[in-house]
């Protein structure tokens, strides 16, 4: 049994880091493998993560962690029974993938303006809370070419757009994702999408 693709890990900068790797053949990850992880500080002890399958030869492990600080460094040991398959380390603050925003809502009752709001996925005492910016993706269910991205570079989790910038009388979907420039994070996963019917009054033509 060998590791084909070494574990790579990302942290949500809150309580979970996710590590993924590939073995050289089909593996029952949860019965055959264990990932041990240990914070490199005095009196810290190793914790065990039981991996799950992620495709035939792929494994994924969700490591429980404390609130992350930039000084945190973990040793990682991947074991198959008594055999050490791989040894490495992981600094959560250098591999951050934010949590996905939630509760995306489209408010359509604001005088021909669409107001999209969502929730910041972090509590106020988390460092990322005040450092997230967002991308909102809006697309038409009827027309695959009608696909747009709005970059929200301010902190407030909301976006206002004129309803008239979208076609009237058809259904649209929206989703949102987040990233934090300060930690050069990757983008989060997209939030679940929300659907609405876009309709607005065309302005009277003046002759």
């Amino acid at each position: 049994m060998k590791v084909l693709q070494e574990p790579t890990c990302v942290s949500d900068y809150m309580s979970i880091s996710t590590c993924e790797w590939k073995m050289n053949g089909p593996t029952n990850c949860s019965t055959e493998l264990r990932l041990l992880y240990q914070l490199v500080f005095l009196l810290s002890e190793a914790h065990t993560c039981i991996p799950e399958n992620n495709g035939g030869a792929g494994c994924v492990c969700h490591l429980l962690m404390d609130d992350v600080v930039s000084a945190d460094n973990y040793t990682l040991d991947l074991w198959a029974g008594q055999q050490l398959l791989w040894k490495g380390s992981f600094k959560p603050s250098e591999h951050v993938k934010p949590r996905a925003p939630g509760n995306l809502t489209v408010h359509t009752n604001v005088s021909d303006t669409l107001l999209l709001t969502w929730s910041n996925p972090y509590p106020p005492d988390n460092y990322l809370y005040n450092h997230l910016t967002y991308a909102v993706n809006i697309w038409s269910e009827n027309d695959p070419a009608d696909f747009r991205i709005y970059n929200v570079t301010y902190l407030e989790p909301s976006l206002r757009i004129a309803a008239s910038t979208l076609k009237s009388g058809i259904s649209y979907r929206a989703r949102v994702r987040a990233w934090a420039q300060c930690y050069n994070t990757t983008w989060s996963e997209w939030s679940p999408s929300t659907k609405w019917h876009n309709s607005y009054r065309e302005p009277f033509e003046q002759h």
Partner: antibody, heavy 117, light 112 residues
Framework: EVQLVESGGGLVQPGGSLRLSCAAS????????MTWVRQAPGKGLEWVSA????????YYADSFKGRFTISRDNSKNTLYLQLNSLRAEDTAVYYC??????????WGQGTLVTVSS | DIVMTQSPLSLPVTPGEPASISCKSS???????????LDWYLQKPGQSPQLLIY???FTAKGVPDRFSGSGSGTDFTLKISRVEAEDVGIYYC?????????FGGGTKVEIK
């Protein structure tokens, strides 16, 4: 919210014994090393002993080895300190604390041990 | 054992003015990743100690930003940018390099 509540202190005669307890809540107890620190009246802080999260590893200041024993019951989320052969100079407030990143991130309110005849 | 030495023993302060406390260790507290294994604690009158600063310069959650830690190796400083009445108490440094953990003797901060 992390809470640590010590109990078991009181008046004991020289040469006597006591068992201090520290009930923990608000965090996953098994994941953290725990420590006892004491403070004699009007004096500074003195580290006594620590125990790893699993309970398998224990650590003591030299002056307490052989007389004090640290232990934990992870099923009860409780830390203990057994004090034997007590002396007048062991009179102190005994604090339990939760370790993180080497340091003591949360402290209990303390329990007073008085050794006197 | 690592010996921690704090100064001054007592520090009378004026509210609104800055204050600083020194802590020296008998051996270097700097580790390979560039972090210093030193914490600062405050024990307010009649209360348990509370963590202020960890790893030399990281402010603990809920601690006002007027508190800051600096220094490296064997020489460290805790600074209060503008002292408030609620900051009175005894301040301790502690190393986290190895067991036994050892504390400095404490610095008593009181209002003038």
């Amino acid at each position: 919210e992390v809470q640590l509540v010590e109990s078991g202190g009181g008046l004991v005669q020289p040469g006597g014994s006591l068992r201090l307890s520290c009930a923990a809540s608000g965090f996953t107890f098994t994941r953290y090393a725990m420590t006892w620190v004491r403070q004699a009246p009007g004096k500074g802080l003195e580290w006594v002993s620590a125990i790893g999260g699993s309970g398998g590893r224990t650590y003591y200041a030299d002056s307490f080895k052989g007389r004090f024993t640290i232990s934990r019951d992870n099923s009860k989320n409780t830390l203990y300190l057994q004090l034997n052969s007590l002396r007048a100079e062991d009179t102190a407030v005994y604090y339990c604390a939760r370790h993180l990143r080497g340091g003591l991130w949360n402290w209990g309110q303390g329990t007073l041990v008085t050794v006197s005849s | 054992d690592i010996v921690m030495t704090q100064s001054p023993l007592s520090l009378p302060v004026t509210p609104g003015e800055p204050a600083s406390i020194s802590c020296k260790s008998s051996q270097s507290l700097l580790e390979g990743q560039g972090y210093n294994r030193l914490d600062w604690y405050l024990q307010k009158p009649g209360q348990s100690p509370q963590l202020l600063i960890y790893l030399g310069s990281f402010t603990a959650k809920g601690v006002p930003d007027r508190f800051s830690g600096s220094g490296s190796g064997t020489d460290f400083t805790l600074k209060i940018s503008r002292v408030e009445a609620e900051d009175v108490g005894i301040y301790y440094c502690m190393h986290t390099v190895q067991t036994p953990l050892t504390f400095g003797g404490g610095t008593k901060v009181e209002i003038k």
